[in-house]
Interface confidence: low
């Protein structure tokens, strides 16, 4: 006598949004408010994530899926599923343990998150600097002076102190 799957496990019939209630003869009970089950056959419903404080709700919890959070203005998500919110900085800054600090000379950050990165070293590619870098923007490399056609004005490369990696301490 071969029993069917649902006889072996009555809980397999419980749809998402319910849980298999062992206290009620394994009948499918609806997930209580503020809880969810995202797959069938679950024996408990999970508590919905609550987006509090610096987190705000991006998607409400339903009986079949958890809430999703993002961060309030001035903060951005970090980690899987936005597990943390990190403070935004301005462009041209990076977040340190002491707060937002301007990028050191020779580095830039064009986003509100992340770290300051060195300007591109145009000379490594045999190019010259077409537009100087700033705290917010990388340098723009142009053709090397040798590539310029006669009569075209050459672009003066930056002074050595402006090379990346030589930031004042």
């Amino acid at each position: 006598f071969e029993r069917t799957r649902s006889l072996q496990d009555p809980c397999s019939n419980c749809p998402a949004g319910t849980f298999c209630d062992n206290n009620r003869n394994q009948i499918c009970s609806p997930c209580p408010p503020n809880s969810f089950s995202s797959a069938g056959g679950q024996r408990t419903c999970d508590i919905c994530r609550q987006c509090k404080g610096v987190f705000r709700t991006r998607k409400e919890c339903s009986s079949t899926s958890n809430a999703e959070c993002d961060c309030t203005p001035g903060f951005h998500c970090l980690g899987a599923g936005c597990s943390m919110c990190e403070q935004d900085c301005k462009q041209g800054q990076e977040l340190t343990k002491k707060g937002c600090k301007d990028c050191c000379f020779g580095t830039f950050n064009d986003q509100k998150r992340g770290i300051c990165r060195p300007w591109t070293n145009c000379s490594l590619d045999g190019k010259s600097v077409l537009v100087n870098g700033t705290k917010e923007r990388d340098v723009v490399c142009g053709p090397s002076p040798a590539d310029l056609s006669p009569g075209a004005s050459s672009v003066t490369p930056p002074a050595p102190a402006r090379e990346p990696g030589h930031s004042p301490q």
């Epitope: 949004g17 609806p30 339903s62």
Partner: antibody, heavy 116, light 107 residues
């Protein structure tokens, strides 16, 4: 806004199969299961089964086991219900319905007529 | 399977009337009951879930109550748009089952 749009009416001969589609929009398809319900002329609503749209696992009502197949295509946000070995009693309007705490949004229905 | 028995099967009423439809479950279904409205040739629309919670956009004249085996849908003041067939449904256990419907018609 949430919308479920079903395929058009079908006329089938006894013994044939029919496949009805249900295209979802206005929400994340894999966040909610999809159920299929039918209604014969002048009759009550009859539940046929459901599919976990995330995993693709279907569950069927006993009365339809062996004759119904519910599938989904997540890339198209579409669920399908295929009913085989059709008989005249299968003449009905077939509905798909998104499922949250209840069947909260329904397709417009697909009339399937089984006639020789 | 759990049987859901609705009464009355037909109800004649006038605009402005208070209308009550009842639904009895063959066994305890906790509060896992929904109510739907269906107009001729149209798909059902969810009105109430968890016995008493109104679905988004449903007018406040619709209310639901009950738990266990006895449930009620009340329309406090019937409007012309409310003439339709109403179904209860339990979602306590698989398979979800529907009542036979109550047709609310113009007196």
């Amino acid at each position: 806004q949430v919308q479920l749009v079903q395929s058009g009416a079908e006329v089938k001969k006894p013994g044939a199969s029919v496949k009805v589609s249900c295209k979802a929009s206005g929400y994340t398809f894999t966040d909610y299961s999809m159920h299929w319900v039918r209604q014969a002329p002048g009759q009550r609503l009859e539940w046929m089964g459901w599919i976990n749209t995330e995993t693709g696992e279907p569950t069927y009502a006993d009365d339809f086991k062996g004759r119904v197949t519910i599938t989904r295509d997540t890339s198209a946000s579409t669920a399908y219900m295929e009913l085989s070995s059709l008989r005249s009693e299968d003449t009905a309007v077939y509905y798909c319905a998104r499922y949250d705490y209840a069947m909260d949004y329904w397709g417009q229905g697909t009339l399937v007529t089984v006639s020789s | 399977d759990i049987q859901m028995t609705q009464s009355p099967s037909t109800l004649s009423a006038s605009v402005g009337d208070r209308v009550t439809i009842t639904c009895k479950a063959s066994q305890d279904v906790s509060s896992a009951v929904a109510w739907y409205q269906q107009k001729s040739g149209k798909a059902p629309k969810l009105l109430i879930y968890w016995a008493s919670i109104r679905h988004t956009g449903v007018p406040s004249r619709f209310s639901g109550s009950g738990s266990g085996t006895e449930f009620t849908l009340t329309i406090s003041s019937l409007q012309p748009d409310d003439f339709a067939t109403y179904y209860c449904q339990q979602r306590y256990t698989t398979p979800p089952t529907f009542g036979g419907g109550t047709k609310v018609e113009i007196k």
